[in-house]
């Protein structure tokens, strides 16, 4: 099966926890850590938000 794009942390996302626990065997979760699913969602909606704001400018 192909890996879902939000299942794996991207380097530019900073503190990140893979949403597939098998991809995080060390257990790096902290209070500051967001799952890759959340970060992927945030990244896409922020891009959309930036696009709207740029369009208004």
């Amino acid at each position: 099966l192909p890996t879902l794009p939000w299942s794996v942390c991207q380097e530019e996302w900073g503190d990140c926890l893979p949403s597939d626990p098998d991809l995080d065997p060390v257990g790096t979760i902290t209070n500051e850590t967001k799952s890759s699913a959340e970060l992927y969602f945030l990244k896409t909606v922020l891009q959309q938000k930036d696009g709207i704001e740029d369009g208004l400018g």
């Epitope: 967001k34 959340e38 969602f41 945030l42 896409t44 909606v45 922020l46 959309q48 938000k49």
Partner: nanobody
């Protein structure tokens, strides 16, 4: 400022269904929104998110195909239809609205979902 109020939680048996609702105190059509959950002793985790217009939907891998997020911008409500519930879904479920680079700004008080085996 936006107040968010969740409802629809309860106790359900494994395999059962629940629908959670989140009512906002004012218009939320300009905001992305999401559902999070927190089980006892665990961190709060992202469950599902939805973009401003109902597009751009993402789910936690373990709920994909079982949970459905939706919104009604005319009623300022966010919903989470939860099917095929499992004991591992037991948690307090929170809705959240409006995104910045650090995460969500507005949070509800949460509603308890308990899935018994």
């Amino acid at each position: 400022q936006v107040q968010l109020q969740e409802s629809g939680g309860g106790v359900v048996q494994t395999g059962g269904s629940l629908t959670l609702s989140c009512k906002a105190s004012r218009r939320t059509s300009g905001f992305a929104m999401a559902w999070f959950r927190q089980a006892p002793g665990m961190e709060r985790e992202f469950v599902a998110g939805i973009g401003r217009t109902g597009d751009n939907i993402h789910y936690l891998d373990s709920v994909k195909g079982r949970f459905t997020i939706s919104r009604d911008n005319t009623k300022n409500t966010l919903s989470l239809q939860m099917n095929s519930l499992r004991p591992g879904d037991t948690a307090v479920y929170y809705c959240a609205a409006d995104v910045t680079k650090s995460g969500f700004i507005y949070w509800g008080q949460g509603t308890q979902v308990t899935v018994s085996s």
